[in-house]
Interface confidence: low
């Protein structure tokens, strides 16, 4: 019996379409597939950012694959041909690996890239990113932000920069249609007459950086002689009620009584008839059912009850 062999794929390469980290991996079928015309050849592709401990692996019959990468680092990938056992009367046959790498040649020293990049998606409506200039860069240095997400034909440059001393230190984004629940890619590059500036790449998902508005319309209702119900309303905006978690801070007679996290817009508090003053504030955050992460809102305005008997009274701010 002659040993069955198969060649690796040809022309394996990583192509950068200019989407700031979303890359194409593509290849051609191996040479000498004539013996396996009745067979569907498959490919096992492994890829990772250089420095990552684990490879991502896929098996496909296609001649291309797309995924997002961190362009601050290099990318390495390898692929081999698989002949399923049905083609070889027994065991699966694998070719040797074809390998390729890709990286963007870095310009400038690392210290010249932007520092402390921070992006917040305010109330799931307005994206704002800010940064600090690189260490030791001169005032003639300016930074430019580009962004892309699936749905855009090409990367776009920021058109509304936040400036300080003539330098761009942030970007106010326009309305971003259908941009959540997918990777959002950003590149901040720079220019200076004196020295090259290092580019920085960032990837995140917008739903994970939402900072909601604080809750509104805080009220008290006496439910019984020893219970008070605290209520509030979700803030105005596109975030549905099911997406909120809340943190409440309650003070009774100038002492912190309770800090609680709840999923609904109510909280029942045990209290005594001796209570002279009761105050509470609430803040909101997008919960795990709608995002993987989020930012707490600012605290609401404080709602207080003082002095009067709560048994017959509902307070509305």
């Amino acid at each position: 019996d002659t040993e069955i062999k198969v060649n690796p794929p040809q022309d394996f390469e990583i192509v950068d379409p200019g989407y700031l980290g979303y890359l194409y991996l593509q290849w051609q079928p191996p040479l000498s597939l004539d013996h396996f015309k009745e067979c569907t050849v498959e490919y096992e592709l492994k890829y990772r950012n250089i420095g990552s401990e684990t490879w991502k692996t896929i098996i496909t019959k296609n001649l291309h694959y797309k995924d997002g990468f961190d362009l601050n680092k290099g990318i390495e990938a390898k692929i081999h041909t698989l002949l399923p056992w049905q083609c070889t009367n027994g065991s699966e046959v694998q070719s040797s690996w074809a390998e390729t790498t890709y990286w963007i040649s870095p310009q400038g020293i690392p210290e010249t890239k932007v520092q402390d990049m921070d992006c917040v998606y305010y109330n799931w409506q307005y994206l704002l990113c800010s940064w600090k200039p690189g260490i030791g860069v001169l005032l003639d240095t300016n930074y430019n932000l580009f962004y892309w997400y699936e749905g855009l034909d090409h990367a776009l440059q920021c058109v509304d920069y936040i400036k300080a001393d003539g330098q761009n230190i942030g970007c106010r984004f326009p309305y971003l249609e259908a941009s959540d629940y997918k990777d959002f890619y950003i590149c901040v590059n720079g220019s200076s007459e004196n020295k090259p500036i290092r580019s920085s790449y960032f990837t995140f998902q917008l739903q994970n950086i939402v900072k909601p508005l604080p809750p509104v319309y805080l009220t008290f209702t006496r439910e019984s002689s020893c219970e008070i119900k605290l209520k509030w309303s979700i803030p105005l905006g596109p975030i549905p009620a099911r997406c909120f978690d809340y943190e409440i801070e309650i003070r009774e007679d100038d002492t912190t009584l309770v800090t609680a996290t709840v999923e609904n817009e109510t909280y029942t508090l045990k209290t005594t008839n001796e209570t002279r003053q009761l105050c509470f504030v609430v803040r909101s955050k997008v919960n795990i059912y709608c995002s993987d992460d989020g930012i707490w809102s600012e605290w609401s305005d404080k709602q207080c009850w003082e002095g009067e008997d709560l048994s017959k009274k509902t307070l509305l701010r």
Partner: nanobody, 128 residues
């Protein structure tokens, strides 16, 4: 260690519906695939459906296309198999499986080699 717990199996009449659930725990990856397999009495393991956590791409066996639907829960680590227009030949033990090394679902025909964690199975019986 990854743990998978299936639920939702039972006895149903032909033409009826069931929803199977699979809850995964004990893993940290954002990139993985989860799938459903079944084994009818006296038969081999058959791939039914698969879904990717990253892309939500789905694949189905020809025998269940248009009748079964795979979906993810809000918490991502839960996957459902909504089965409708059930037939007696759908009777089997249904297994949930997961592979945290992969980012997209393979072809159904190659699914058997793409999963490294398995549940205990839940019995589905379609009979009048």
């Amino acid at each position: 260690e990854v743990q998978l717990v299936e639920s939702g199996g039972g006895l149903v009449q032909p033409g009826g519906s069931l929803r199977l659930s699979c809850a995964a725990s004990g893993f940290a990856s954002d990139d993985y695939i989860m799938g459903w397999f079944r084994q009818a009495p006296g038969k081999g393991l058959e791939g039914v459906s698969c879904i990717s956590s990253r892309y939500a791409n789905t694949v189905y066996a020809d025998s269940v296309k248009g009748r079964f639907r795979i979906s993810r829960g809000n918490a991502k680590n839960t996957v459902y198999l909504q089965m409708s227009a059930l037939r007696p030949e759908d009777t089997a033990v249904y297994y949930c499986a997961m592979d945290s090394r992969r980012v997209t679902c393979p072809e159904i025909s190659t699914m058997h080699r793409n999963f490294d964690s398995w549940g205990q199975g839940t019995q589905v019986t379609v009979s009048s």
